[in-house]
């Protein structure tokens, strides 16, 4: 209802003698700010006076008068929303009702709060989950309906009176909704904690005991078992008897079923706490345990390893590895079922005892071909000697031995001959299946291990073969020593180093890359004409007429080889210049006259210069000079000059005669 003041605070607060109480409180007045506040203890309304009677614990008025009790009781609020109170220390007789009398300018209100102060510190309360199972983490909660800023406390957990190692998380609440101190402990109980006492102890700041709460743990767990065996070492010989007993040391709830397991598999019709094994055989060796179940699940005992002893059985040999590669290491393992394990071994190679070999394993670090054969063994323990088994075969493999390449041809071999080679070897395991030849070529292999080289090349210097099984063994290369005519014959200019100019001294060299046999002869020719028989062809002073196509020949006892034709180019300045005239050297005025500068030059003329009879240059640079229309005054001697990269040449004078036209003569 809108005519009420609105308050929020805990309904009841709890404390004990000598402690303190902190009352969190908020309010909202009907109008304006708070003008007067009185804290009553057990207030009662007096109808006569229309006022409240009771012990005044705190008073705050406009004139600011405060009773002496105010040192113990404090109003920590304000004039419009906070009404928090503190009583420190709190006494037993403070129990009852606290009345907060609030007055604003026009409105009044009495708010009641219950205070419960006990003589001694009251105990906390332990809260447990409904069910606790072994090894499943649970949270234990210890709750105390008390918290006060002026009175620090602590909650400690104990198991059977001993502080618990696990870290607890303590939290406090001092709000208008609730006031408490809480400790939470995360804990994974084991079956051994069943029935143990857990205590939550309230202590003051100095660790002094104030109160406590205790609970007994009910930890649900699978049955816990112990197994006993006769004989106690569980070692017997075939035909002996064995007894095993299963004892339950703890179970919560009670167990329901019993069974026995061997090597993890359930034994049929064995559902009592005792297992009797009569006249045991070696097959009954193994790991035994008992299993007892309750509502939580099955519990298993530790395993008992029953060993039934017997003499070695017939042995077998395992080879690591066969077939073995020559030079590798091999290990032989003698395998024989026996209990106890064999203490001595005898080894045989091809039926013959191997001296000094008494271990389970025989190691040969470097296998040789003679190590091949049958290996067998005999095992021995305290109960007797086993039989020799069938044995195992060691196959020693190795690459082909003593491989050679053999030339079948008569010597010497000439370029173009057909050459036959064979690949021979001494021994091989496994058998030779293929052959390889170096270098590779498009050669024929008419039969296994034979190579036929048709049209043998001049550069087939050496050949090597390999005989191959799983590996290839290469023979040393054999030299074919092929004889051939001179190769790569070519003309090379030795001098000059740059281009050849007319008048230069010129030397040409006839080069070849190789010849076998080495003794050679040279021949030079130009246009089918023999010029010389030396390796060099020399010109003291070259002329343009020496230009042309040159070849050299080199021959030996096998044959002769010619070079490619080599063009000798002679560079020279323009020469044999002359001026030709078209249509002729006599032209009628008004017509066209074309003067052409003809020349012989290498490289060709790049540009021309034209001159008249007074050696004055005309503004033309091309081979032809065209005069159109030609005039009588143009009559005279003309000459030209040609230029190329080598130099210049000039023509003799050529005279142009321009005569008058009939029209001109007629006008005169």
């Amino acid at each position: 209802d809108s005519s009420k003041w609105v308050f929020e605070h805990p309904e009841t607060l709890y404390a004990w003698e000598g402690a303190c109480v902190w009352i969190p409180c908020t309010y909202r007045a009907l109008d304006g700010d708070l003008e007067s506040f009185i804290l009553f203890h057990n207030p009662e309304y007096n109808k006569n006076t229309s006022k409240f009677d009771g012990t005044r614990l705190y008073e705050s008025t406009k004139d600011g008068k405060v009773p002496s009790e105010q040192k113990r009781v404090q109003f920590l609020g304000d004039k419009n929303k906070n009404c928090t109170l503190s009583i420190h220390p709190v006494h037993l007789n403070d129990s009852g009702q606290l009345g907060l009398r609030m007055e604003s300018k026009t409105e009044k209100w009495m708010e009641r709060i219950h205070l419960n102060v006990s003589e001694r510190p009251f105990p906390p309360h332990i809260q447990l989950p409904p069910e606790i199972q072994e090894s499943q983490e649970v949270t234990l909660t210890c709750l105390l309906n008390f918290s006060c800023y002026g009175y620090p406390i602590q909650l400690q957990w104990l198991l059977e009176g001993v502080p618990m190692r696990q870290a607890a998380v303590t939290s406090t609440s001092l709000t208008i909704k609730s006031v408490f101190t809480r400790s939470e402990l995360k804990f994974s109980p084991q079956w051994s904690h069943h029935g143990k006492i857990v205590t939550c102890q309230l202590q003051d700041a100095d660790g002094k005991f104030l109160s406590n709460d205790t609970v007994q743990l009910n930890v649900k767990h699978t049955p816990k078992l112990e197994i006993k065996v006769t004989p106690s070492d569980a070692i017997v010989r075939e035909g002996d008897s064995v007894t095993m007993t299963c004892e339950v040391s703890s179970s919560n709830p009670e167990y329901t079923t019993v069974s026995w397991l061997k090597d993890g598999t359930s034994l049929k019709k064995q559902n009592t706490f005792t297992l009797n094994l009569r006249e045991v055989t070696k097959d009954q060796s193994g790991k035994y345990c008992c299993q007892v179940s309750n509502d939580v699940g099955p519990g298993r005992s530790e395993e008992v390893f029953l060993q039934v002893q017997y003499a070695p059985e017939p042995s077998t040999v395992q080879i690591l590895h066969s077939p073995a590669v020559e030079g590798s290491q091999v290990e032989f393992l003698c395998m024989s079922l026996a209990n106890p394990l064999p203490t001595n071994y005898t080894w045989y190679h091809n039926g013959k005892e191997m001296q000094g070999r008494t271990e389970e394993k025989v190691h040969i670090p470097k296998i040789l071909p003679w190590h091949a054969g049958t290996y067998s063994c005999v095992a021995e323990n305290i109960l007797g000697t086993g039989q020799r088994g069938p044995g195992a075969e060691l196959d020693v493999q190795y690459p082909p031995k003593k491989v050679t390449t053999v030339i079948q041809n008569p010597m010497p071999i000439r370029e173009g001959d057909t050459v036959t080679l064979s690949c021979n070897y001494n021994s091989s395991n496994p058998s030779v299946t293929r052959y390889e030849w170096k270098p590779h070529g498009a050669w024929e292999e008419p039969s296994l291990g034979v190579l036929k080289i048709q049209n043998v090349g001049w550069d087939n210097t050496t050949i090597a073969c390999a005989a191959c099984n799983s590996w290839c063994s290469w023979a040393s290369p054999v030299a074919l020593n092929v004889q051939y005519a001179p190769r790569d014959v070519r003309v090379r200019k030795i001098k000059p180093l740059s281009e050849i100019h007319s008048g230069n001294s010129v030397s040409l060299q006839c080069d070849f890359s190789s010849s076998h046999p080495k003794e050679v002869q040279f021949f030079w020719e130009k246009n089918g004409r023999l010029l010389g028989k030396e390796s060099q062809l020399n010109f003291d002073s070259i002329s343009p007429e020496d230009a042309g196509s040159y070849s050299c020949w080199v021959n030996n006892s096998i044959g002769q080889t010619a070079s490619k034709a080599w063009t000798l180019e002679v560079l020279y300045a323009p020469r044999r210049l002359r001026v030709s005239m078209s249509p002729g050297d006599q032209v009628m005025e008004g017509k066209s006259a074309t003067l052409t500068c003809e020349s012989d030059a290498n490289p060709p003329v790049s540009h021309y210069t034209w001159f008249d009879w007074n050696n004055q240059s005309l503004p033309y640079h091309s081979q032809k000079l065209r005069l159109e229309p030609v005039k009588v005054q143009h009559s005279g001697a003309y000459w030209c000059q040609g230029t190329n990269s080598v130099g210049k040449g000039r023509s003799p004078l050529s005279t142009l005669t321009v005569y008058y036209s009939p029209e001109t003569i007629g006008r005169r």
């Epitope: 540009h607 008249d612 007074n614 005309l618 503004p619 033309y620 640079h621 143009h634």
Partner: antibody
Framework: QVQLQQSGPGLVKPSQTLSLTCAIS??????????WNWIRQSPSRGLEWLGR?????????DYAVSVKSRITINPDTSKNQFSLQLNSVTPEDTAVYYC????????????WGQGTMVTVSG | DIQMTQSPSSLSASVGDRVTITCRAS??????LNWYQQKPGKAPKLLIY???SLQSGVPSRFSGSGSGTDFTLTISSLQPEDFATYYC?????????FGGGTKLEIK
């Protein structure tokens, strides 16, 4: 320094004769190391060489084939100038006409006149 | 007649750029090749003669090269005043002929 000053009408009627003169200062029209050229420029034809006159031991002329039948370039030694006459003009002859000196040393047009815009229009 | 082919016909560049213009003759003209610069409303101005010789008074950033049929004009670092049209011309034989021009514009 050498300068070339052009003169002549800017408008010529079709079929009439276009006449331009190029006055030389700083050099001689009779120089035996120069040639005196006429060049024209139009948007359609670009730069087009028309012809030249030059003196060595006598006077010579060279003309472009495209105008050979209609062109005359004459030197005037008394006035140290040379002229261009182009007969039977058509609107195709509308262009900027330049005179230029070509020297033997460079074989290039090193000095140019200021140019004359000639319009052929009826 | 000897035809002169210039490329490109137009070119956009910025101040400081290096620019190259090429000119090809329809037949060998030795080194008788000249380069001109023309600005709007003005007569052409000789820059390079005989393919590679710099005309007196022309800045050294202009250079020419080539002989036979292929020729090049290079401006090493463009200046604002270099934006114009450039022409090549052969003086090997009559009729004397010019290239179609290359217009160099500011980018």
């Amino acid at each position: 320094q050498v300068q070339l000053q052009q003169s002549g009408p800017g408008l010529v009627k079709p079929s009439q004769t276009l006449s331009l003169t190029c006055a030389i200062s700083g050099d001689s029209v009779s120089s035996n190391s120069a040639a005196w050229n006429w060049i024209r420029q139009s948007p359609s034809r670009g730069l087009e060489w028309l012809g030249r006159t030059y003196y060595r031991s006598t006077w010579y002329n060279d003309y472009a084939v495209s105008v050979k039948s209609r062109i005359t370039i004459n030197p005037d030694t008394s006035k140290n100038q040379f002229s261009l006459q182009l007969n039977s003009v058509t609107p195709e002859d509308t262009a900027v006409y330049y005179c230029a000196r070509e020297v033997s040393g460079t074989s290039a047009f090193d000095i140019w006149g200021q140019g004359t815009m000639v319009t052929v229009s009826g | 007649d000897i035809q002169m082919t210039q490329s490109p016909s137009s070119l956009s560049a910025s101040v400081g750029d290096r620019v190259t213009i090429t000119c090809r003759a329809s037949q060998s003209i030795s080194s008788y090749l000249n380069w001109y610069q023309q600005k709007p409303g003005k007569a052409p101005k000789l820059l390079i003669y005989a393919a590679s010789s710099l005309q007196s008074g022309v800045p050294s950033r202009f250079s020419g090269s080539g002989s036979g049929t292929d020729f090049t004009l290079t401006i090493s670092s463009l200046q604002p005043e270099d934006f114009a049209t450039y022409y090549c011309q052969q003086s090997y034989s009559t009729p004397l002929t010019f290239g179609g021009g290359t217009k160099l514009e500011i980018k």
